[in-house]
């Protein structure tokens, strides 16, 4: 199983059988009357993984997912029949597919489902403390799920619940045509993106939503939505997809005369993830599939990891691109996209930009406007007509950090762990695929920290049958990875150091930041441990320097090093 170290070949390739035999995967193979284990909520404090599925919500123990509680939340027979009469599939559509699962407060979760094409939401009691062992549906309190969950289970939803308000990117109608970014719940009138205007949203597929602070003043907080959508005519010849990042001010309450109960601070920009191609034409990875925000020292400046695939039928490929929030903010402070009419090209807007600059949050920091309802008419008019930025956001180092083009799978999900190793910190990516495998990739800084080399450490099959991975969460506390698909949920440790072999050289050559040779075995590396010198070299994977004892003998000839 141990492969030699070419970038595109995993050092360790483990089949599902091997994962099981080595106790490296625990699988929950689903219930007979459920499926679609797509909606994850990780609660490290309670040591639970909440999972929304078809007609069910689960609470798995993070230590071992075989230990779980479940809530059954189906639709009524009447509702199911109405759905069937509307021409929908009784098994695949006429059920309650859970699409939203968020922490509401200290004692409750908020959950929404498709409700057999009639979205519905409710609260789930989870108690104050883990030992309360409470997990029950609030049967007396159901709410309309419109603008929160889609009607159609096939549609993606991105949501975020903060301060009792739910931000959702979803379809608000039965037909799945009226896509919008909503803010619901709370005490205010719902707010949404402009209706019937393809410049705002053009058949989007929502990926995720995140709150990111702009400054130390909470009035400047913004909610960022990641999505992909059809490129607007004139942006591209032919039908194309663009990956997007959209921003909204948390304290946006809509306009006064125009954009009433609509966002006044919504802006969007294109995310570029491409490689130079032949004839000087870049190959674009435009189909954004997943996003992970790596919050390290500064929560205002997380690193954004995006997983992309190509939309081409001829060329199938996947990539991971990294973005910095400073680059994102720079684009949102740059020129707006403008065109004089449907038959004109998009150009950077050259005219006078009204004050305060559209997209700026009303706060005491900038502009002195207390509310979006106080914004001057020219700001609202401009915002309504110019939701898109002209410049795209380019990835760090202007290229992907991971590319896969010669394989029979595509990337679907990503989570990232920052690991302390002997020679520094490394970001380890766990990338889910559409065939049920997980790739473990480490990005290794070269000359500069953003000039990265990627090393494919492991390729693990985590489900018995090939099935697309649709959800992933990583628990740093448990050092475990949790994976969701249509078929079920899987759990695996972040590291399998013992599998790298019985010698120092093999451990060193693995270049796995989690693992180091401790003198007798390849085991988990803890930077705080006062153990005897650990042999590890992630940057170069050089056993000659680090394995001075007999651990190398007789083994070096088997592992040709290609870096």
């Amino acid at each position: 199983n141990y492969q030699n170290g070419k970038n595109n070949v995993p050092r360790l390739k483990l089949s599902y059988k091997e994962m099981l035999e080595s106790n490296n995967v625990i699988t929950f193979n689903g219930l007979a009357n459920s499926s679609s284990y797509h909606t994850f909520l990780l609660d490290e404090e309670r040591s639970r993984l909440y999972v929304g599925a078809k007609d069910h919500i689960f609470s798995f123990d993070l230590v071992n997912i075989k230990d779980f509680q479940k809530i059954v939340w189906p639709v009524s027979y009447t509702r199911r029949d109405e759905c069937k009469w509307a021409g929908k599939d009784i098994l695949k559509e006429c059920a309650n597919f859970i699409k939203v699962l968020k922490a509401y407060n200290q004692t409750h979760l908020y959950a929404c489902g498709t409700g057999a094409f009639h979205p519905i939401c409710t609260y789930i009691e989870i108690g104050h403390h883990p030992e309360d062992n409470i997990f029950k549906l609030e049967n007396s309190h159901f709410e309309n799920g419109r603008g929160k969950s889609p009607y159609d289970p096939k549609l993606l939803t991105a949501s975020l619940l903060i301060d009792g308000e739910l931000y959702s990117g979803t379809a608000a109608d039965f037909m799945g045509r009226d896509f919008a970014i909503f803010r619901t719940l709370g005490h205010h009138h719902p707010i949404r993106t402009e209706q019937h205007d393809s410049r705002w949203l053009n058949d989007p597929k929502f990926i995720s939503a995140h709150l990111i602070s702009e400054s130390d003043n909470p009035e400047d907080d913004k909610v960022y939505f990641f999505f992909r959508e059809n490129a607007i005519d004139g942006e591209h010849s032919g039908k194309a997809t663009h990956a997007r990042i959209g921003q909204i001010c948390k304290n946006d309450f809509g306009g006064h005369r125009s954009l009433v109960n609509k966002w006044t601070t919504f802006l969007k920009a294109r995310l570029i993830c491409s490689v130079p191609g032949p004839n000087g034409i870049d190959t674009h990875f435009d189909e954004l599939q997943d996003v992970f925000l790596m919050n390290f020292k500064d929560p205002k400046n997380p690193v954004v990891y995006g997983v992309f695939t190509t939309s081409s039928n001829i060329f199938k490929g996947s990539a991971v691109c990294m973005y910095s929030m400073s680059d994102v903010r720079r684009v949102f402070l740059g020129p707006y996209a403008h065109r004089d009419g449907p038959n004109y090209q998009w150009v950077p807007y050259q005219g006078r930009v009204p004050y305060p600059r559209p997209g700026t949050c009303p706060s005491k920091t900038f502009g002195g406007f207390d509310s979006t309802k106080d914004l001057p008419d020219d700001v609202i008019t401009f915002a309504r007509s110019h939701p898109a930025m002209y410049n795209p956001v380019f990835p760090m180092n202007n290229r992907p950090i991971v590319i896969k083009t010669d394989v029979n799978y595509q990337f679907t999900q990503i989570v990232v762990d920052r690991v302390d190793a002997e020679d520094g910190q490394y970001d380890v990516m766990f990338i889910g695929t559409d065939v049920g495998t997980v790739l473990k990739v480490v990005s290794i800084p070269k000359e500069t920290w953003y000039d990265l080399e990627e090393v494919l450490l492991e390729e693990m099959t985590v489900f018995r049958e090939p099935t697309a991975i649709s959800a992933m969460e990583l628990s740093t506390k448990q050092q475990q990875l949790y994976i969701g698909s249509t078929a079920g949920v899987a759990q695996l440790p972040l590291h399998r150091c013992d599998i790298y072999g019985k010698a120092c050289a093999e451990c060193c050559l693995a270049r796995d930041p989690y693992c180091a040779w401790d003198g007798s075995a390849c085991s988990r590396y803890f930077p705080t441990a006062k153990a005897r010198t650990r042999a590890q070299d992630i940057r170069n994977g050089d056993p000659l320097t680090h394995c001075s004892d007999g651990g190398i003998e007789g083994r070096m000839d088997h592992h040709h090093h290609h870096h």
Epitope: E82, C83, W85, A86, F117, H118, P119, N144, G145, R146, G147, Y151, A172, D173, F174, M175, R177, D178, H189, P190, R192, Q195, H196, D197, S198, R199, R257, S258, L259, V260, N261, R384, S385
Partner: antibody, heavy 123, light 112 residues
């Protein structure tokens, strides 16, 4: 005070054309979606067509699709309905109506209506 | 044939309470879309009476109230007055063509 004033109705032969206008005042016209709704003599209301504030979205009832064209001129605060290939069943009072979107879920309501203009299609 | 079904007529004596029903399907009212009600006095244009199932625009007396449940909605008028004699229409969103759907209308007659 919000006012909508339709004009352009009249008697026309089957296959003929008419252009209806609706002059709006008392509100920011270019902030609202506008619609045409008709009512055949002694019958109920039927939505005919709708247009978004910037004409980016336009929709028609199947019964008029391909024959009627809705448009607006925000600089003149005016909504139009060009009706071609008129049929006897198009005989109705045509109302211009503003979409209010007052409800929580932004489902269109018609918060202001004009007094209507009668279109009679007959030979 | 209207997409939403209303009774053709209802009647009541002054001071009485009457209700007008409006029945749709799973692709309009039953899909969670809001219902709005209009009053059309003889020879005049319709006027918005109730929006968003149960909300009254300013100027509409509180004798008028609306509710919605499942695939149906209803308009209730209490303390019936002679000037309430009119046609009443319910309306909802459909998401499919036609994008807006109306009921066939209900003629309210105030007896006496």
């Amino acid at each position: 005070e919000v006012q909508l004033l339709e004009s352009g109705g009249g008697l026309v032969q089957p296959g003929g054309s008419l252009r209806l206008s609706c002059a709006a005042s008392g509100f920011t016209f270019d902030s609202y979606e506008m619609n045409w709704v008709r009512q055949a003599p002694g019958k109920g209301l039927e939505w005919v067509s709708g247009i978004s504030w910037n004409s980016g979205w336009i929709d028609y009832a199947d019964s008029v699709k391909g024959r009627f064209t809705i448009s607006r001129d925000n600089s003149k605060n005016t909504l139009y309905l060009q009706m071609n290939s008129l049929r006897a069943e198009d005989t109705a009072v045509y109302y211009c109506a503003r979409s209010g979107y007052s409800s929580s879920w932004f489902d269109p309501d018609f918060d202001y209506w004009g007094q209507g203009t009668l279109v009679t299609v007959s030979s | 044939q209207s997409v939403l079904t209303q009774p053709p007529s209802v009647s009541g004596a002054p001071g009485q309470r009457v209700t007008i029903s409006c029945t749709g399907s799973s692709s309009n009212i039953g899909a969670g879309y809001d219902v709005h009600w209009y009053q059309q006095l003889p020879g005049t244009a319709p006027k918005l009476l109730i929006y968003g199932n149960s909300n009254r625009p300013s100027g509409v007396p509180d004798r008028f109230s609306g509710s919605k449940s499942g695939t149906s909605a209803s308009l209730a008028i209490t303390g019936l007055q002679a000037e309430d004699e009119a046609d009443y229409y319910c309306q909802s969103y459909a998401g499919i063509n036609p994008y807006v759907v109306f009921g066939g209308g209900t003629k309210l007659t105030v007896l006496g």
